[in-house]
Structure formats: C-alpha cells, structure tokens
C-alpha cells in the first residue's frame, strides 16, 4: 500500500534497513558508521551548493526473533516484515537502503508498490536484474557473466590464441552470498553464459573437482570457482595438476593481491584470479580501518548509497523538482556520481560498473601480475601484459579442450 514519505519541506529522510540476515556477516554498528559518515559528506555537499536542507537516516532494525540464521537463507520474509514495520509507523523515507540479500530484495520488489528508489549493497542474483527502481552498488552476477563470455571468446591476444567454449564450474553449496549467486548465474541453463558455451558441467563434490585435475578424459581444461586462495588450497592442496588446466578463481571483493609484500603461493600457479581494481583512500577511513577487504567493500557500498542519494537530491532540488515522484524513483541509473573513493558509474539498469582485473602468478617473481583489465561499462577487455611469464606452455593459455589428455 502507499506509505507517506518523510521527504519534503526541506527535510529528507533515508530509510536504512538493518537486517539480521545480510550478504556479509558485518556488525550493524559498522554499517551505521558508514551511513553516518556518508551523511556528513552529503550535508557538506548540499551546503556547499547553497541548499539549506536537512538530511537524516532512520535505521530500521528487525526484531531478530524469527529470521535469525544470520545469512541470507531466511531473509525473504525479514525484508517484508521490515517494510510492514515502516508502513505501520508511517516512517518511509525518500529512499530505501538495503536489503543486501537477493531473496529479500526480489521479494520486496515483487510485493510492494515501489514509488521510491531502493539502493542495495548486494542483491547479486540474476533475479534482481533489470528492476526499474533498484540500484545495486556491488558487482552483480550479470557483470561477471559478461566478462567470462567476453574472455572465453577472445582469441586474438598474444597469450590467448584460442576461443574457449567449455568449462567446469565448481559449486559445493558452502559459498558466501556473492559467490553463491555468481555461480548460480553460471549454472543456470537459461543464462547468457550457458547459452554461449558448448559444454558446461557443475562439479558439486570436492572429489569431483580433485579427479578432474588429472583426468585424461576431461571435457574441459577450464574450471571456474569462487572464493579466496585459502578456499582453493583446502580443496586442491598440493595435488598434481595437469599442465593445461586453467583454474579461474573469482574473488572480486578482495584486494590483498595488490599489496606490495604479497607472494603468490605455489598452488596458485595454474590459477587466474578475477578481482576488482583496488580502491585507495579507503585504507585510512575511520569506518573501514578494522574491516577485512570484503567487508570494506560492503560498508563502502552503504556509504556510496548515501552519497548517491545526496547526488540525486541535489540535482532534483536545484531543478526545483519534486522528490516523491516516480521520476525520482527511476532516476538512480545511467549516471556517474562522486563516490567516497572516486567516481562511481551506474549503467542503464542502475548496476555499478567497474574495472575487473585478471591476475596471473609470475613464474619468475612468484608475484601476482595484471594480465588484463575489463571495463564492465563498455564490455571490453584491455590486455596489460603482452608477454606474461605464465606457467603454461609457451607462455600462452592452453586450448580449453585437450586433444590427447594432459600434455
């Protein structure tokens, strides 16, 4: 039902859903700190623009009695319960920040008359694609899928002279929320990735993965998985790996690879790591100092959500336009705004664009090196290292299909 919004007469409120079930196990206090830091910046920017208005956030907490798994499995109803709470209290702001779980976002979007914008730090799944009033500030599965298809098709680089059309996907059900939806998208039979590949099999057991590494009859040399190096080591250990196996490790929200003193462990030599380009100023920020890289990205998305609202509020106020309109609700897309750590670009569907980075381990230096970058905004790959010191034969990525088993 239509809920009146606290969003006029120079006073603008942001409703922040503080859900017990979250994409990342982040203390809600840290998210509050991120939101409050964002509010300070927004107030300063509005004041500098000569706009004498009040901007506040209302944190809406779930009672946690029913929906207490802590992860996203029981988030579907928690989001709706919080919306009901907002509705009963007549406390809807101009914008809703949260939820982060794909299940809850999808359900909330489905079950509500959305005449206000929703900003999410998460909602990675394909089911949250193309939603008219939803903005996602962490890379959704669709962006990953487009990179992989682009990379698979690439065959004109000095280090990749074969198009690939096959893959194994390792997915054992213990993944983090981001990985769960990334792999889900690759597994889905109707997805772009599946449509473009000739062969794709999901490996669900550790043993299946381990057997493939030296199986002469394997149908693909390429295995996609999601997680960090430690996750790979637990699975692979020091097992022998056929020399034309390529493991693609998706680890988007982890910038440890870019630290100066990091040495790649030996088990990473057959691995290409896909991550996001690292931020810079965040390292000194008050809200992020004690956070792990993944959690820093999550908290940053909350902060950037506040800055995005401030950006849109400023534009609409300067143009003398009403905030409580469908026009405002649909405006949070196809733009670039000043985020906390640099510019943030949103595509036509309100999803964040980024630079994805594919890293390899140099056999010379045992360091991670950038092989190529990929701009999600233009769906384009840019080679960086034209003569990589790979472990693979002739310093080229092998074909995805082995002619005669491990060479």
């Amino acid at each position: 039902s239509q809920v009146s919004q606290n969003c006029h007469n120079g006073s603008y409120e942001i409703s922040v859903l503080m859900m017990g079930n979250s994409a990342f196990a982040e203390p809600l206090k840290n998210l509050e700190d991120a939101v409050n830091e964002g509010l300070e910046i927004v107030r300063g920017r509005l004041q500098n623009a000569g706009l004498n208005v009040t901007v506040n956030a209302t944190f809406m907490y779930s009672d946690g009695l029913i929906h207490n798994s802590g992860d996203c499995r029981s988030s579907t109803c928690e989001g709706l319960d919080l919306l009901r709470k907002i509705s009963n209290a007549q406390r809807m702001g101009c914008v809703l920040i949260g939820p982060s779980c794909t299940y809850s976002t999808f359900q909330m979007y489905l079950d509500t008359e959305l005449s206000y914008p929703m900003i999410s730090a998460g909602s990675f799944g394909l089911s949250c694609d193309y939603k008219e009033t939803l903005t996602r500030l962490m890379s959704p599965a669709r962006k990953l899928m487009y990179f992989l298809v682009n990379f698979w098709k690439t065959n004109d680089l000095p280090f990749k002279t074969y198009s690939w059309s096959t893959s194994y996907v390792y997915k054992n059900g213990t993944e983090t929320e981001d990985c769960f939806w990334y792999l889900n998208a690759l597994e889905a039979s109707v997805s772009y990735f599946s449509h473009e590949l000739g062969f794709k099999v999901v490996l669900r057991q550790d043993k299946e993965f381990q057997d493939i590494l030296m199986d002469h009859n394997r149908k693909s040399n390429v295995i996609i998985m999601c997680g960090g190096p430690e996750f790979l080591y637990k699975l692979k250990g020091d097992r022998a790996v056929a020399e034309d196996i390529v493991i693609i490790l998706v680890d988007l929200f982890n910038d440890q690879y870019f630290e100066d003193n990091v040495t790649a462990p030996d088990y990473m030599k057959n691995v290409l790591v896909l991550t996001l380009s690292p931020g810079n100023s965040l390292l000194n920020s008050s809200f992020s100092r004690n956070l792990s890289p993944t959690k820093r990205d999550f908290a940053l998305a909350y902060l950037n959500g506040i800055l995005l609202f401030g950006h849109m509020l400023k534009i609409f106020l300067e143009n003398g336009e009403n905030i409580t309109t469908p026009k405002f609700a649909h405006a949070f897309r196809n733009l670039t705004f000043e985020g906390y750590d640099g510019p943030v670009t949103l595509d036509d569907w309100g999803d964040v664009d980024s630079t994805m980075v594919l890293l390899y381990t140099s056999v010379d230096t045992k360091k991670y090196k950038v092989l190529l970058t990929y701009d999600t905004h233009v769906n384009k790959t840019y080679p960086v290292d034209m003569s990589p010191t790979f472990t693979w034969k002739n310093s080229k990525l092998p074909n995805d299909i082995t002619g005669r088993g491990p060479q």
Epitope: Y257, F258, E259, S277, N280, G342, P343, V384, D385
Partner: nanobody
Framework: QVHLVESGGGSVQSGGSLRLSCAGS????????MGWFRQAPGKERERVAT????????HYADAVKGRFTISQDNAKNTLYLQMSSLNPEDTAMYYC????????????????????????WGQGTQVTVSS
Amino acid sequence: QVHLVESGGGSVQSGGSLRLSCAGSGYTYSTHCMGWFRQAPGKERERVATIDKDGRTSHYADAVKGRFTISQDNAKNTLYLQMSSLNPEDTAMYYCAAAEHRGAWCPLWDRSAPLLAHIHWGQGTQVTVSS
C-alpha cells in the same frame, strides 16, 4: 610534489609523425606508472597508452595500436609517445599522467582513471592533424 611537463605537440598533416615528451620530477619511476591520455574538444579524456613501473608492461587504446609507441628513459626521467600514421581523429590535447603503483596495480588502468584524485597530470600539449 610531482611535476610533469609535456612538449613536442604541434600541427602535422595526415599520415605524419610526432614525438611527445614528458619530463617528470618529484617521484621515482620504480614506484610510479606513467601514461598518455588525450582529450578532444567536447569529449571525455581517454587513455592512449600506459607503461608500468618496471617499464615492461604497455597498455594501448585500440585506436592507436600499431601506430603509437610509449617508452621511457629512466636516466632522464622522461616519458615518450612516438606517434606515426597520424589522422585527424588523433587531434586532441595530450596529457602526461603519473600514479603510484599499488603492488601489481597501476591506477591508470582503471576505467575511471581520468577522474581519480590520486593521479598526477601535466598541463598538456596540443596535437592537431589536418587532412
């Protein structure tokens, strides 16, 4: 304080060549990556070519591949851009840029590089190519 000064721009006929130079001070090549960007009137600043702190990884825009070559002379603290087979689409203001490496990462490779605060820029040198 990082200071970058470009030179070598000018007017040239289509098919001609130019060599741009960028003299730098206030930083060391061993910690910074360097690059050339350009901005045509009414357009956004775009990456042309970059070179990493080791001087071995070059990164070119599609439009200039095979025609432009980036190089550096560490002894002279100078970055170069050799441009050949120039065409009118290459007309722009050319800027030299420097940024501190973060491990393997050069911020000039980021899609948002022209807008990032921690990148140092020169004043630019104009290149005009007439048909």
